[in-house]
């Protein structure tokens, strides 16, 4: 099943996807597509990278993070209701059937006419810079700058933990983004 992310009409949506390059600058091709990941590539490609650079993109879709460090999270600018749906992030790791694929579900909500002031933001639209975890002994806090190197399995595990409603209550709004896939 897909991980769900949310954004409001008119906002930018953020769909996280990561990998750890084997060595700095040793990149692998990545594609983003609208629709669930098929057997090969991405259907309806909106953005693509090779080992050096972004080599294909369409308007409103871009990589805001440092893709040279493996942050291939997709930003969709000024979303509309039509942007709702499944997106595929495919990390085309060389070798036989090595590529990693992630299906992410984007839910677009109508814009609020009069947004009520609130300290808490929908954590699936924008993760804060600081994440406090609990439920596993003493609370520990990690800033973005001190996050350890993590592999795809750890990313997936962390994403699952973030979806836990207990953790959602600990997310504080500081206007930055934890980039996890």
């Amino acid at each position: 099943s897909e991980v769900e992310y949310r954004a409001e009409v008119g906002q930018n949506a953020y769909l996280p996807c990561f990998y750890t390059p084997a060595a700095p600058g040793n990149l692998v091709p990545v594609c983003w597509g609208k629709g669930a990941c098929p057997v090969f590539e991405c259907g309806n490609v909106v953005l693509r990278t090779d080992e050096r650079d972004v080599n294909y993109w369409t308007s409103r879709y871009w990589l805001n993070g440092d893709f040279r460090k493996g942050d291939v999270s997709l930003t969709i600018e000024n979303v509309t209701l039509a942007d709702s749906g499944i997106y595929c992030c495919r990390i085309q790791i060389p070798g036989i059937m090595n590529d990693e694929k992630f299906n992410l579900k984007l839910v677009i909500k109508p814009a609020k006419v009069t947004p009520a002031p609130t300290r808490q933001r929908d954590f699936t639209a924008a993760f804060p810079r600081m994440l406090t975890t609990r439920g596993h002994g003493p609370a520990e806090t990690q800033t973005l700058g001190s996050l350890p190197d993590i592999n795809l399995t750890q990313i997936s595990t962390l994403a699952n933990e973030l979806r836990d409603s207990r953790l959602a209550n600990d997310l504080r709004d500081s206007g930055a983004t934890i980039r996890i896939g």
Partner: antibody, heavy 125, light 108 residues
Amino acid sequence: EVQLVESGGGLVRPGGSLKLSCVVSGFTFSDYGMHWVPQAPEKGLDWIAYISGGSISSGSSTIYYADTVKGRFTISRDNAKNTLFLQMTSLRSEDTAMYYCARHDWRGLYAMDYWGQGTSVTVSS
Amino acid sequence: QIVLTQSPAIMSASPGKKVTLTCSASSSVSSSYLYWYQQKPGSSPKLWIYSTSNLASGVPARFSGSGSGTSYSLTISSMEAEDAASYFCLQWSSYPPTFGGGTKLEIK
């Protein structure tokens, strides 16, 4: 004009080997994934191998095989020569078919949009 | 793997008649990744319909495609002699990609 031209087919004994080639023109070969699809006489189509494009070097491709050819067939590409290969070993009579190469168009139609004319492989003693 | 079953295996139709070919999947297929190919004797396959309902370049408007889940179809609104060929469906939603066994369409 997009063109794909296969070669290398022929008659081979069971257990033997063949190397098929597919030379392409009319598009930027390195940008596109490529497939091999055999068609047994009077039968349907049967996908067997895929190699991804979008890589600068030929060695950094993602590869997929059908279970029926895993360990026996090897797909590869030489981007500098605009050529796709299929190395076939331990050939069996059931490998007898017309072998087509096909382009995987991720930009527009997202699948096997152009096919070669095929090269015939017969495995028989 | 997903098995695609095409029916009928062989059919003949008179010019001007409506023709419907079906492709049934053993489990659900994303409509984005269900394709149809046309093949004439001695020729290689040609992409005919992509993503269930989109006609490939040069395909006459009398052709259409529809379906979802496990049931897909290709329809010719008015059969013409040049439509006589074999038609294969393909899914590449799930590994491995699979083709249907084909329908051979003949002109009466």
